[in-house]
Interface confidence: low
């Protein structure tokens, strides 16, 4: 019967420089002796070398010299007694490129080189980049373990050195950033920033690195309300906004968070289950009415928490004036002026551009003021007749503006004539 020597190993394998590869391999050889059991030795050689003299690249024979350049990097993996000749190559070097053959020796009878099944190894330049592993999503304030590893690297060869860089790492002790693992407690401001793991084989000048952009989940920390692109001042979760009555109002509520918080507006100070008046960050009032004085609340709802801010809306108006109107009555000339404004305005009467303050000491005029609802009324009584044409004016004003009205009182055929010509001057 013909002796059977068989080897099953892939024809070629490619590995990047500095990385590792496992080449599966199995073999068979004829062994029928039952009376002696010499040790089984297997060897991997560089192609073209003479087995009797050459240094081996890997063997299980403790008495054979191994090439210094492959010592510790080329290793037999698996049980040779079970006909496993798998070869582990670590920290591959360019000079490892080439062909290798396998040889088996057992006693005097089995000495065979499997020259027909050579392994071709090609070592290429390193382009592999490290991987950064961590459990997503990153949550603000929650410590997370990150690790950096180079796919395909293994223990063989000079140790790997690591360095981490990124804005998120600023408070860390420099020693911490030289490990393959680090614990990061991300902050909201770390969202969108880069984190880089750089890796270098000790003794090598070339580094390889991987950069990831951090996706940090964080609840809203602040709410800002913008009116016409300008942020309103906020004190103790409340903002005060004076608005002119009748004006259109468009407010934008912004609460930076990741993922974006759901923004909504409510009338007044709402309960948690209240129905919003706007389901976006935008509140639009086409014409502000005094009835809307009071407030609105912007709420930012987020899986990690919610935040809300109260907007105290103060509706103001310019003075609106009715009058003056004048008539002759028993006590003299009686002029009336009505006005409406928020906040309540001040009012003064003028006679021929001269202000009439309070009541005349000589009793020549008298001023009375009263208010009912949003309207306020003031009356002026002038005692005695008119000696000539006379202009009577009333003026109302508040911090937002003023309005005035006048009447021209024309002298009639007699002093009791009532020719009153209103004129808006």
């Amino acid at each position: 019967e013909k002796p059977v020597y068989e080897l099953q190993v892939q024809k070629s394998v490619t590995v990047q420089e500095g990385l590792c590869v496992l080449v599966p391999c199995s073999f068979s050889y004829p062994w029928r002796s039952w009376y002696s059991s010499p040790p089984l030795y297997v060897y991997w050689f560089r192609d073209g070398e003479i087995p009797y003299y050459a240094e081996v690249v890997a063997t299980n024979n403790p008495d054979r010299r191994v090439k210094p350049e492959t010592q510790g990097r080329f290793r037999l993996l698996g049980d040779v007694q079970k006909k496993n000749c798998s070869l582990s190559i670590g920290d591959a070097r360019m000079e490892d490129t080439g062909s290798y053959f396998f040889r088996v020796e057992r006693g005097r009878d089995v000495k065979y080189s499997y020259q027909q099944n050579k392994l071709n190894l090609e070592v290429t330049a390193l382009i592999e980049k490290p991987d950064i592993h961590f459990l997503e999503p990153l949550e603000s304030g929650r410590p997370t373990r990150l690790s950096c590893s180079l796919p395909g690297s293994c223990e063989a060869g000079p140790p790997l050195t690591f360095s981490w860089t990124g804005n998120a790492l600023s408070p860390l002790d420099p020693e911490t950033t030289r490990s393959s693992e680090l614990t990061l407690t991300p902050r909201p401001e770390d969202h969108g920033t880069n984190l880089t793991c750089q890796m270098k084989r000790q003794g090598a000048q070339v580094t390889t690195e991987r950069t990831v952009q951090l996706n940090v989940s964080y609840a809203p920390q602040t709410i800002t309300i913008f009116r016409n692109g300008i942020a309103l001042e906020i004190l103790q979760n409340t903002s005060y906004l004076p608005v002119l009555e009748g004006q259109a109002l468009r407010l934008l509520c912004d609460a930076p968070s990741n993922p974006p918080a759901h923004l909504s507006w409510f009338q007044g100070s709402p309960a948690l289950n209240a129905t919003p008046i706007s389901n976006t960050g935008i509140l639009e009032l086409r014409r502000v009415r005094s009835a809307e004085e009071g407030g609105f609340t912007c709420r930012a709802q987020h899986p990690l928490g919610f935040l809300q801010i109260f907007l105290n809306l103060s509706v103001y108006s310019l003075p609106q004036l009715l009058g003056p109107s004048c008539s002759w009555e028993a006590e003299g000339l009686h002029c009336r002026c009505s006005f409406r404004a928020r906040p309540a305005p001040s009012l003064c009467w003028r006679l021929e551009e001269k202000p009439l303050e309070g009541n005349s000491s000589q009793g020549s005029f008298k001023v009375n003021s009263s208010s009912a609802g949003p309207w306020a009324n003031s009356s002026l009584i002038l005692h005695g007749g008119l000696s000539s044409d006379l202009k009577v004016s009333c003026k109302a004003w508040n911090i937002y503006g003023s309005q005035s009205g006048s009447v021209l009182l024309l002298q009639g055929r007699s002093n009791l004539g009532t020719g009153v010509v209103p004129a808006a001057l």
Epitope: E17, G18, R93, A125, L126, R201, G203, A204, Q205, V206
Partner: antibody, heavy 118, light 107 residues
Framework: EIQLQQSGPELVKPGASVKVSCKAS????????MYWVKQSHGKSLEWIGY????????TYNQKFKGKATLTVDKSSSTAFMHLNSLTSEDSAVFYC???????????WGQGTLVTVSA | DIVMIQSQKFMSTSVGDRVSVTCKAS??????VAWYQQKPGQSPKALIY???YRYSGVPDRFTGSGSGTDFTLTISNVQSEDLAEYFC?????????FGSGTKLEIK
Amino acid sequence: EIQLQQSGPELVKPGASVKVSCKASGYSFTDYNMYWVKQSHGKSLEWIGYIDPYNGGTTYNQKFKGKATLTVDKSSSTAFMHLNSLTSEDSAVFYCAFYYGYYGVPYWGQGTLVTVSA
Amino acid sequence: DIVMIQSQKFMSTSVGDRVSVTCKASQNVDTNVAWYQQKPGQSPKALIYSASYRYSGVPDRFTGSGSGTDFTLTISNVQSEDLAEYFCQQYNSFPLTFGSGTKLEIK
């Protein structure tokens, strides 16, 4: 065969600028940083900086910031160094170099002589 | 910046001799040091990396040693083709810096 072929010698007037090129061949240009080194006559070597051809990112020696600008043209596998506001102090041989493979075998260009003279 | 000091500007030796070129770093650079040989009119050629590892193809008469701040390049059995200037370089931190060079003269 890996090669770095630099542009020829330059004679320039003070105040002018010059652009030195370095054409790479025989390897994947975008996989390795390209370094630039200055060697003044009879003097030592000074590291100017490097560029990552993959993304154009640069790192400069503080001393050469504002003097040298490093760029690359990926389509032609060429690295460039632009030197501005030249003075006689800038007269030197400029080398491009890169470290190949995991163990960083350095390959250097043949050097470009820049002479600044009125 | 890390300063690499090569205190000997020139060294004279004979063919067959053994010569040591020294280099001192202004601060600890571990073993992140390379040695270069530059012949007149040529680009620098790398001999040693990581203080003591020879690049492929470099004759084994060139050996490097040292760590921390003190480094040595030793050439045993000096040959006439070793006439050149030798530079040390640190790559522990940017900017990379070179020594001022030591010129080897053959008697």
